[in-house]
Each structure stands twice: as C-alpha cells, then as structure tokens.
C-alpha cells in the first residue's frame, strides 16, 4: 500500500513530478529526433524520508532497515509511478516517421 | 494503423450550423504532442486549416473563422467535433480532419463533401 | 497571417526532367513542409521541416530553402508525380498553406 502524503521535510522537498525543459541538444537526441525542438520533461525529484509515498512494503522495509543500517541499506528512490505517453517525429533510415513512447514523461510517483 | 473518418450532413442551408465529426484509431489524444486538425478544400482549391486541438485541451483556430468555429473532443471514444455557425455557400468544401503530431499532419481522412444551398 | 506564394501555379513537365516547385513567404519562418495531393484523395506529406524526406517517399523528391523562400526538387518526374503540391508552414498561427502548383505530365 502507497503510504503518507505529508512531506515532513518541508514543501517541495519530498518526492514528487516536476517539469524540467530540455532541449534536443540537453538530451542529445538532436541527431534523431526532429521535434519537438524542446521537451517539458516530467521527472520524479524529491527525498523519500520515512513512510512516505512508499510504493509498496518492500519500499517500507527499506525504509525501516535504512534508518537502521544506513552504510548498507539505501533509502527508498523517488521514481515514476507511472508514465504519460509522448510522440516524437522521429529520422529513420526509411525517412521521418512517427514513434509514440509509452514510459517517456513521469505522470506520478513514489518511492520504493 | 492510423484511420480518420469525417462525417457531416452533406447538405445544409444557410445560416445554419455545420456539425462535423472526426472519428479516429491507431492514436490517442491523451498522447502528449497529439493532436486534431481540420482543414478544408473547396471544389478545384487549395488547402486552409481551420482549427487544432491538443492532447492538453489547448485549441487554435483560424482567425478569420474564429468566431465562428467551436472545437470539442471525446478523448475516450476517439472523437472530435467542430462546429461552424451562420454558414453560407463560401462554406461549400471537402472538410478534412488530420492526426496532428507537434507540427505535422500526418495521417488525413478521406474528407467529407458539405454543401451549403 | 503569414502568406505563402507558389510558383509557377501550373507546371508542365516531361518524364525524366528536373523540376523545382518554389514557395515565398510574407514573412520569414523557421521550417516548411511540402504535400503532394493526387485527383480525388486527401493529401500526404512528401517532405517533413525543410528537408526530411517522409517515410515511404521516393529519393527523387527533396526540399530546401531558409528564411522567407522554400523550395521542393523532383530529380527526374515520373507519371505517377502527377499532383497538386502544397507548402504549408506552422512557424506561427493561423498555420497556412500556399495556393498550390498542379504538375501536369506532358
């Protein structure tokens, strides 16, 4: 069970999507992709302290076992939940074509 | 594989409202860079786009028709609308809708034929 | 709006020949595409932003171009080019298409 939504680091700082704009050149797709020119790319960023947003009990336990052992266990990571998809018009070798990404924009997320 | 169907009333009088509908598969617009586009062509002439609309709701109209275009979706069952007001026998065209992808038409349907008399 | 000008509006052409379509624009835009529309169907892209051939597009067909002049080469025409073609650009709204060339095969 995903647990708490309070973040007991304070606004902002827990995990969480935000928009970081990229250009094809930051991502170095410049050679392949055609557009978008810049991508508003969702990305999951932020600490996972205690309980919260763990995904599963798995992410719980590696919470518990981090406060315990820290120089061994590491704390839960902040990754998607799951994803909005994206098309990019796309060079291939047979010419501009159209390709969908299904896992390509973070849509929520949470820590395990 | 990407289809677009057009569908509208062929014949109207004029002062009325052009309903059309864009049916589509092989895409979704809750796809983030897709879009709907329309576009018309009257009878031995060229192209003029009419209206888009986007994955995120946004919509763009021409504006010499702005006023009188009005743009919907039904991104569950692939359809999307648009309506004309007041229309007259300048309105006479083949209405075309496009799969948008960013800035290109990439797939078209094979366009619906509207008379107004 | 930005105006898009083709020219010539009607070409004739032989098979085998090179042939430049052109497209002048009232103001300057970042990128152009080109589509091809044959006799009674909806039409298909041919170049993609200026220069990219789309998928399935035969090599005879290429674009070039920059600022407010654009232009679509077809190296040696063949029967089956025989078409209305568009140039369109999207740089700003209201996105606009050129008023069209017909090639015609002599």
């Known amino acids: 069970a995903r647990n708490g939504d309070h973040c007991p680091l304070g606004p902002a700082a827990c995990c969480a999507a935000h928009t970081v704009r990229a250009s094809l050149e930051d991502l170095g797709w410049a050679d392949w992709v055609l557009s978008p020119r810049e991508v508003q790319v969702t990305m999951c960023i932020g600490a996972c302290p205690s309980q919260f947003r763990a995904a599963n009990m798995h992410a719980q336990i590696k919470t518990s076992l981090h406060r315990l052992k820290p120089d061994t266990v590491p704390a839960p990571c902040c990754v998607p939940a799951s994803y909005n998809p994206m098309v990019l018009i796309q060079k291939t070798d047979t010419g501009v074509s159209l390709q969908t990404y299904d896992d390509l924009l973070a849509k929520d997320c949470h820590c395990i | 594989q990407v289809t677009l169907k057009e569908s509208g009333p062929g014949i109207l009088q004029p002062s009325q409202t052009l309903s059309l509908t864009c049916s589509f598969s092989g895409f979704s617009l809750n796809t983030h860079g897709m879009g709907v586009g329309w576009i018309r062509q009257p009878s031995g002439k060229g192209l003029e786009w009419l209206a888009n609309?986007?994955?995120?709701?946004?919509?763009y109209y021409n504006s010499a028709l702005k006023s009188r275009l009005t743009l919907s979706k039904d991104t569950s069952n692939n359809q999307v609308f648009l309506k004309i007001s007041s229309v007259d026998t300048a309105d006479t065209a083949t209405y075309f809708c496009?799969?948008?992808?960013?800035?290109?038409?990439?797939?078209w349907g094979q366009g619906t034929l509207v008379t107004i008399s | 709006q930005i105006v898009l000008t083709q020219s010539p509006a009607i070409m004739s052409a032989s098979l085998g020949e090179e042939i430049t379509l052109t497209c002048s624009a009232s103001s300057s835009v970042r990128y152009m595409h080109w589509y091809q529309q044959k006799s009674g169907t909806s039409p298909k892209v041919l170049i993609y932003?200026?220069?990219n051939l789309a998928s399935g597009v035969p090599s005879r067909f290429s674009g070039s171009g920059s600022g407010t002049f654009y232009s679509l080469t077809i190296s040696s025409v063949e029967a089956e080019d025989a078409a209305d073609y568009y140039c369109?650009?999207?740089?700003?709204?209201?996105?606009?298409f050129g008023g069209g060339t017909k090639l015609e095969i002599k």
């Open positions: 932003s200026t220069s």
């Open positions: 496009a799969q948008v992808a960013w800035d290109w038409f990439a797939y």
């Open positions: 609309i986007w994955w995120n709701d946004d919509k």
């Open positions: 369109h650009q999207w740089s700003s709204y209201p996105w606009t």
